[in-house]
């Protein structure tokens, strides 16, 4: 009877949609790389499902993922980073669905950090600076950054600026006076590697000065 039950389970499993997506992070922990995969359907019953990656690996043919709640995760030095790996969803020894993926085309950078904004009174501008761990990396060094800022009261009115450096100047006259602004930044691979936007950095909040009525200029904070 248990045999029939297992077969039935497998037949049921084959009716489900096991679409999944993955992203890699290179040199995320020293020389270790990571690979994270998750099902696109959050309602998939993942109880007996495992992920396996085979091919384009160093010293092994295949690696199994660790399951961390709803995501599947590998941290290893064993990615060859040349050619395509086969990533499969498995029940026991049976593969339910597989994708051939080059891990250098699904790179998600680490989120930028240390975002800050400094007002320069003499220049009448704001200097935005932030940091990224990728400056120290061997592989994914070149990134495009997306700086987004908005007046705090304008919930969905974000202004975006793309830049390749980690410094941006915002002119005071382009901002509303005596207003509170929120600003954040994210990154995407821009050269040699392909992939996805990083998570957003933590937001930074700053206030623009009042307008000085006599000169028509803003007061410093």
């Amino acid at each position: 009877e248990s045999g029939y039950a297992q077969n039935g389970d497998l037949e049921d499993a084959e009716l489900d949609d096991y679409s999944f997506s993955c992203y890699s992070q290179l040199e995320v922990n020293g020389s270790q790389h990571s690979l994270t995969c998750a099902f696109e359907d959050p309602d998939v019953n993942i109880t007996n499902l495992e992920f396996e990656i085979c091919g384009a690996l160093v010293e092994v043919k295949c690696l199994n993922f660790r399951k961390l709640q709803e995501i599947y995760f590998i941290e290893t030095k064993k990615f060859l980073l040349i050619g395509k790996s086969n990533i499969c969803v498995k029940v026991g020894e049976k593969s339910l669905t597989c994708k051939k993926i080059d891990l250098t085309t699904i790179v998600k950078p680490e989120a930028p950090f240390d975002l800050s904004v400094v007002y320069r009174e003499g220049a009448n501008d704001f200097v935005v600076t932030f940091n990224t761990s990728h400056l120290q990396k061997k592989y994914v060094k070149v990134l495009m950054h997306d700086v987004a800022y908005r007046q705090e009261k304008d919930e969905n009115k974000w202004t975006h600026v793309n830049l390749s450096s980690t410094k941006l100047t915002l002119l005071q006259r382009k901002l509303q006076p005596a207003a509170m602004y929120e600003i954040k930044v994210r990154s995407i691979p821009d050269h040699y590697f392909k992939g996805f936007w990083s998570e957003w950095s933590p937001s930074y909040y700053f206030r623009t000065p009042e307008i000085n009525n006599s000169s028509g200029e803003m007061d410093p904070i």
Epitope: C54, K61, L80, I82, T104
Partner: antibody, heavy 117, light 110 residues
Framework: QVNLRESGGGLVKPGGSLRLSCAAS????????MHWVRQAPGKGLEWLSL????????YYADSVKGRFTISRDNTKNLLYLQMNSLRAEDTAVYYC??????????WGQGTLVTVSS | NFMLTQPHSVSGSPGKTVTISCTRS????????VQWYQQRPGNSPTTVIY?????PSGVPDRFSGSIDSSSNSASLTISGLVTEDEADYYC?????????FGGGTKLTVL
Amino acid sequence: QVNLRESGGGLVKPGGSLRLSCAASGFTFDDSVMHWVRQAPGKGLEWLSLVGWDGFFTYYADSVKGRFTISRDNTKNLLYLQMNSLRAEDTAVYYCARQGDYMGDYWGQGTLVTVSS
Amino acid sequence: NFMLTQPHSVSGSPGKTVTISCTRSSGSIDSSYVQWYQQRPGNSPTTVIYEDDQRPSGVPDRFSGSIDSSSNSASLTISGLVTEDEADYYCQSYDFHHLVFGGGTKLTVL
């Protein structure tokens, strides 16, 4: 259909240079790892070099490291092998090969390089 | 780097089965996939087996690949030999970012 065609082979004197080209068509070139492999007359296959889809990763066999340079131009669907300081033992048929879902899923027809004084 | 050692030649009669071995000199045969290439005289190589035991589309199921951990070797088996199988056969694997070919085996169909 997939087509790889090598060119640039010929007769060259020891110490000379040559640049081989491999023109690719029929597939998404900038999605594929590419290799150069050679075969000396009457001998077996010898892997020489590979380049990642983006040109970032390049690797070489010890026998050609420092003398040969692999590169690619994804805008023109071309793979190159710049060969310097050529020796008699570099005489061979040179093949380019694609690594699609697996290494060597397609090969060119080869171009003969002869190094002789 | 490791080496891959193949017999210089093997032979078999039409309809029979031959096996070509490929022994890895150091490191485990299980640590990286093995490919097999067929090269007929005057032609470029073509893949007959990839990832140890997978057949590209168009390659007849008379061709099969296997791995034997105990002998640290890979094998290419061709059953139901036909005259068109007469060719050189090369195994290939990789070590980090370096590809390694075996020396080749000449198959003669008697």
